[in-house]
């Protein structure tokens, strides 16, 4: 049996189980790509508070992240216009696909920073803290980074959590 057919059959078998994981529209895939050199440290790298996603300690400990990765990879290549039949799916990349990967990573990181700014008040640049010493000089940074990041989003204690968060939107009094 051809490798492609084998993978397709394996994916068919798990697609129904892993469907909710795909709702995050490829951010998971980007994260896995971002972190491939780092051993995956979680049972499932998805938000545990979401129903059917994540694995609590009442469930089985075995990890099926490699299957998830395949499913997510398939879904994401399709949604990004790269079809399973195309040479890109075999790992052959041209400049265009490398650029789109870089864009996805940039989008993922921007979203991560946005959420962290809202939840914890993480500033989006070092200049926001006037006391930051010169070790983080402008020359060390990407000159376009400020433009890519947009305006600084300082979170006040009363601000609500982002709508995508599965944590409750309880206002903070502390």
């Amino acid at each position: 049996m051809k490798r492609k057919e084998r993978i397709a059959r394996r994916l068919e078998g798990i697609e129904t189980d892993t469907q909710p994981i795909l709702l995050q529209s490829c951010t998971g895939l980007v994260t896995h790509r971002l972190l491939e050199e780092d051993t995956p440290r979680y049972m499932r790298a998805t938000d545990p508070a979401s129903p059917h996603i994540g694995r609590s300690n009442e469930e089985e400990e075995t990890s099926d992240s490699s299957l998830e990765k395949q499913t997510r990879s398939k879904q994401c290549t399709e949604t990004s216009g790269i079809h399973a039949d195309s040479p890109y799916s075999s790992g052959i990349m041209d400049t265009q696909s490398l650029e789109s990967k870089a864009e996805r990573i940039a989008r993922y990181k921007a979203e991560r920073r946005r959420q962290l700014a809202e939840k914890y008040g993480l500033t989006l640049d070092p200049e926001a803290d006037s006391e930051t010493p010169s070790r983080y000089s402008r020359s060390r940074k990407d000159p376009e980074a400020a433009e890519k990041r947009g305006v600084r989003s300082e979170r006040s204690a009363e601000s609500s959590r982002d709508a995508g968060s599965s944590y409750s939107r309880t206002e903070l009094s502390g």
Partner: antibody, heavy 123, light 107 residues
Framework: QVQLQQSGAELVRPGASVTLSCKAS????????MHWVKQTPVHGLEWIGA????????AYNQKFKGKAILTADKSSSTAYMELRSLTSEDSAVYYC????????????????WDTGTTVTVSS | DIVMTQSHKFMSTSVGDRVSITCKAS??????VAWYRQKPGQSPKLLIY???YRYTGVPDRFTGSGSGTDFTFTISSVQAEDLAVYYC?????????FGAGTKLELK
């Protein structure tokens, strides 16, 4: 293997400043925020703040604003914390620690810790 | 700031016992609570995050539960190496805060 390696113990005079370093290895330094945590017998574990190594963006515990300054150097995968105007209250073990990561949602708990640096402030 | 209160500073146990450590948040933190174990002379080690999710490599005798303001960390069968200090931490909002710790010791 993911590792954080901090600088050695420091004995410093009151009023002086000290800079602690934390070198990361085994993962992409810019993909995770780096945090600093203080531990004393009296106050237990206290979160000082965090830095995004890629942008230099920071978040501080208000209690430590002005006391601690966090920076990072991407080229050497090293995070730094400068402690200013030291008093005996600043004598503690200081840990650098990496935040855990999620796809889709991001929460700050700490999955990798170093062994810590002991800072003693004494005249 | 959110205060995390661990009501027991010390808990006595025997090897093989089941033990539960509690932690109470001063306000609703949903399920944003992590648990750490710290042995003497070592750094804390992550055991549980998001209230009930066991960190990779952590034995299944460790479990966590709770939401809102009340959280419980349970060791189903205490081993000698479990004698340590256990801390809860809220990761709901800044500043991140820890409980004062519960020291697990032998009876």
């Amino acid at each position: 293997q993911v590792q954080l390696q901090q600088s050695g113990a420091e004995l410093v005079r009151p009023g002086a400043s000290v800079t602690l370093s934390c070198k990361a290895s085994g993962y992409t330094f810019t993909d995770y925020e780096m945090h600093w945590v203080k531990q004393t017998p009296v106050h237990g574990l206290e979160w000082i703040g965090a830095i995004d190594p890629e942008t230099g963006g920071t978040a501080y515990n208000q209690k430590f604003k002005g006391k601690a300054i966090l920076t990072a150097d991407k080229s050497s995968s090293t995070a730094y914390m400068e402690l200013r105007s030291l008093t005996s209250e600043d004598s503690a073990v200081y840990y650098c620690t990496r935040s855990g990561i999620y796809d889709g949602n991001y929460w700050w708990y700490f999955d990798v810790w170093d062994t810590g640096t002991t800072v003693t402030v004494s005249s | 700031d959110i205060v995390m209160t661990q009501s027991h500073k010390f808990m006595s146990t025997s090897v093989g016992d089941r033990v539960s450590i509690t932690c109470k948040a001063s306000q609703d933190v949903s399920t944003a609570v992590a648990w750490y174990r710290q042995k003497p002379g070592q750094s804390p080690k992550l055991l549980i995050y998001s209230a009930s999710y066991r960190y990779t490599g952590v034995p299944d005798r460790f479990t966590g539960s709770g939401s809102g303001t009340d959280f419980t960390f349970t060791i189903s069968s205490v081993q000698a190496e479990d004698l340590a200090v256990y801390y809860c931490q809220q990761h709901y909002s800044a500043p991140l805060t820890f409980g004062a710790g519960t020291k697990l010791e032998l009876k």
